[in-house]
């Protein structure tokens, strides 16, 4: 389906509003340090050019690829070399190498100030004064901080952001209306960004076969009534969509996502009974709804898998002649029967099944060799079940903050070389699994927990890749996508680690501690906890608990004092000395 002008094709398909939004997101994800105004200028220039191509597809440069057009535009930025350094060298390359070069320079942890939320009245005034600019600013600020954010989904977030302001800026109590909505959007946005980052990592580091396997398992759980051929078609289309978005081809990605939503809604009967309510919604909402749709009910009387995958005389023949189809069907059949398993577990089972066939099929008696293959799954299934059970018990016993602290200690002991901010961020997020998943019924716990942990651990992998410091982290991150979580779980105290020298400055606190929000106070305390463990990796739970309890008491005491700063100056060194003694 070739078009004379790709840019005209996408402009017509997407419409001006979505076209402009997506180009802004694309540019902001590539040039994360550029000021907002610069990006708006570039977007307007591209949009005007697109309009000339819509009017006349044969006009000059209209036949160029989107990468060429966008790359040329990005390379006109005057401050490229001083702002981005070696990224400016990308501009000397030809497509497709230039785009690959830009992709490689995307920064998962850009040095940007945290977004500060202004007063509600200030935000409402800005919204009313110039709604378009206000919403573009939102797209820009999110995209530059999350360079792999799923672009069509970001348009959906922006639509919700707009709706929240439209509704709440009219309300009697603006803040009570708006702030919970903004909090929800922020939290959902961070989760969405992290989930998409895992998809892109899967595609970029492990190839499209890894992503397709993930998609077969997940879609088979969601759509257990759909035929394998139907699931395969959805997987192929979904892989194309995510490959495009992860590759910076945001216009194509959004266009193909819309086509996929259209196809799903036109073929509901052969996919799932749960799609009805999604399909009445407008495009952005519809696509989001379809992506989040609950699992359909499993068909009644599904036969045992053993007949086709253990007992059949054709198992080895089918495996050898078309592994992708045969193992894909195995994964589909297993996943549709097991909505109670995590996708990662299902992928491990498929991998174990494949390994058994590869080992057995050339043997003298293949069937005897692989007859007990399903029994071999048991330990693989029990491992995440036990992990979820133990950690949910710990979470219920400790509560979220102390559960996070337990994970902070656990992970700092495993990989003490990792930077403290990364350990705090990752462990805090790992700790959120409790509140997110432990309240769910048994059948939903494992898929919730393990697949969430995969997303969080991917963040660790992505940050570590930028600044590698631990061979153990590199090994767990690169060897196997599906075994990342078990790999990290299996890590023990790093005996080779040389404890960090004690630095009193790290444990010096000031009165500003008292004005911090509860979350910020927690982060400060958790930062201190990580540093303690790095200093004394063999400290016992009891020792660390004692120090942390003393720390909380010391902070509470000084924050109640009349002269807070004097209290911190006097009590701080005492706390440090007592802590050193307790950990000696």
């Amino acid at each position: 389906d070739t078009h004379k002008s790709e840019v005209a094709h996408r402009f017509k398909d997407l419409g001006e509003e979505h076209f402009k939004g997506l180009v802004l997101v694309a540019f902001s994800q590539y040039l994360q340090q550029c000021p907002f105004e610069e990006h708006v200028k570039l977007v307007n220039e591209v949009t005007e050019f697109a309009k000339t191509c819509v009017a006349d597809e044969s006009a000059e440069n209209c036949d160029k690829s989107l990468h060429t057009l966008f790359g040329d535009k990005l390379c006109t930025v005057a401050t490229l070399r001083e702002t981005y350094g070696e990224m400016a060298d990308c501009c000397a390359k030809q497509e497709p190498e230039r785009n690959e070069c830009f992709l490689q320079h995307k920064d998962d942890n850009p040095n940007l100030p945290p977004l500060v939320r202004p007063e509600v009245d200030v935000m409402c005034t800005a919204f009313h004064d110039n709604e378009a600019t206000f919403l573009k600013k939102y797209l820009y600020e999110v995209a530059r901080r999350h360079p792999y954010f799923y672009a069509p989904e970001l348009l959906f977030f922006a639509a919700r952001y707009k709706a929240a302001f439209a509704e709440c800026c009219q309300a009697a109590d603006k803040a009570a209306c708006l702030l919970p909505k903004l909090d929800e959007l922020r939290d959902e946005g961070k989760a969405s960004s992290a989930k998409q980052r895992l998809k892109c990592a899967s595609l970029q580091k492990f190839g499209d076969r890894a992503f397709k396997a993930w998609a077969v398992a997940r879609l088979s759980q969601k759509f257990p009534k759909a035929e394998f051929a139907e699931v395969s078609k959805l997987v192929t289309d979904l892989t194309k969509v995510h490959t495009e978005c992860c590759h910076g081809d945001l216009l194509e990605c959004a266009d193909d996502r819309a086509d996929l939503a259209k196809y799903m809604c036109e073929n509901q009967d052969s996919i799932s009974s749960k799609l009805k309510e999604c399909c009445d919604k407008p495009l952005l909402e519809k696509s989001h709804c379809l992506a989040e749709v609950e699992n359909d009910e499993m068909p009644a009387d599904l036969p045992s898998l053993a007949a086709d995958y253990v007992e059949s005389k054709d198992v080895c023949k089918n495996y050898a002649e078309a592994k992708d189809v045969f193992l894909g069907m195995f994964l589909y059949e297993y996943a549709r029967r097991h909505p109670d398993y995590s996708v990662m577990l299902l992928l491990r089972l498929a991998k174990a099944y494949e390994a058994t066939l590869e080992k057995c099929c050339a043997a003298a008696d293949p069937h005897e060799c692989y007859a007990k293959v399903f029994d071999e799954f048991q330990p693989l299934v029990e491992e995440p079940q036990n992990l979820v059970k133990q950690n949910c018990e710990l979470f219920e016993q400790l509560g979220e903050y102390k559960f996070q602290n337990a994970l902070l200690v656990r992970y700092t002991k495993k990989v003490p070389q990792v930077s403290t901010p990364t350990l705090v961020e990752v462990s805090r997020n790992l700790g959120k699994v409790g509140a997110k998943c432990c309240k769910l019924p048994e059948a939903k716990r494992m898929p919730c927990a393990e697949d969430y942990l995969s997303v969080v651990l991917n963040r660790l992998c992505v940050l570590h890749e930028k600044t590698p410091v631990s061979e153990k982290v590199t090994k767990c991150c690169t060897e196997s996508l599906v075994n990342r979580r078990p790999c990290f779980s299996a890590l023990e105290l790093d005996e080779a680690y040389v404890p960090k020298a004690f630095n009193a400055e790290t444990f010096t606190f000031h009165a500003d501690m008292c004005t911090l929000s509860e979350k910020e106070k927690q982060v400060k305390k958790q930062t201190a906890l990580v540093e303690l463990v790095k200093h004394k990796p063999k400290a016992t739970k009891e020792q660390l608990k004692g120090v942390m309890d003393n720390f909380a008491a010391f902070v509470e005491k000084c924050c109640k004092a009349d002269d807070k700063e004097a209290c911190f100056a006097e009590e701080g060194p005492k706390f440090v000395a007592a802590s050193q003694a307790a950990l000696a």
Partner: antibody, heavy 121, light 110 residues
């Protein structure tokens, strides 16, 4: 010492047939998968097919129909039957064992010394 | 259609040199089913590396393999006189019938 020894090569007319043998010594052939691989003079390696221990066979797409692999475990020998031979089938033909523990991977750890087949009128 | 492209087709090097041979597959090989063989004139090939990076027992550690998916590399860190030979990569795919070798790379004395 484990050895694979090919025999049966020689000069054959276009359109003719030939049966190559691969005699295995030092191991019990009945437990192993054996492949046939050929190499035209001055050219690269070309996989022909495999016979698993169970007797199941698979062939390269180009070899299906003209080439047949069989085995006789009592004689510890694997055979390659070649029909409708053409000039382009001229090559050294090797038998090779698949590394134990693999079934479909291209890992061949033991090779014969090869036998030359020349197809010419 | 399966394509297994090896490059370069020949390389001239001296003893002690580092030699790198690449193998590009289309489509990607199945599950890192990638092997490297060494063949000397008039002899049968010898398996050096399997699963893209695992050394066969008895193969010197100067040989190493890396890569995944579509792009693979065989590296000889310090070429020895006995390493002058032709090297082949071998790939396994979704269908066993697609098992293929690369075109070969001849490592010659400079």
């Amino acid at each position: 010492e484990v050895q694979l020894l090919e025999s049966g090569g020689g000069l054959v007319q276009p359109g003719g047939s030939l049966r190559l043998s691969c005699a295995v010594s030092g191991i019990d052939l009945s437990n192993y998968a054996i492949n046939w691989v050929r190499q035209a003079p001055g050219k690269g390696l070309e996989w022909i097919g495999i016979i698993w221990a169970s007797g199941t066979t698979f062939y390269a797409t180009w070899a299906k129909g003209r080439f047949t692999i069989s085995r006789d475990n009592s004689k510890n020998t694997v055979y390659l039957q070649m029909n409708s031979l053409r000039a382009e089938d001229t090559a050294v033909y090797y038998c090779a064992r698949t590394v134990p523990g693999y079934s479909t991977a291209p890992y061949f750890d033991l090779w014969g010394q090869g036998t030359l087949v020349t197809v010419s009128s | 259609d399966i394509q297994m492209t090896q490059s370069p087709s020949s390389v001239s090097a001296s003893v002690g040199d580092r030699v790198t041979i690449t193998c590009q597959s289309s489509p990607s090989v199945w599950s890192n089913f990638l092997s490297w063989y060494q063949q000397k004139p008039g002899k049968a090939p010898k398996l050096l590396i399997y699963e893209a990076s695992k050394l066969t027992s008895g193969v010197p550690s100067r040989f190493s393999g890396s890569g995944s998916g579509t792009d693979f590399t065989l590296t000889i860190s310090s070429l020895q006189p006995e390493d002058f030979a032709t090297y082949y990569c071998g790939g396994g795919y979704s269908s066993i019938s697609d098992t293929t070798f690369g075109g070969g790379t001849k490592v010659e004395i400079k």
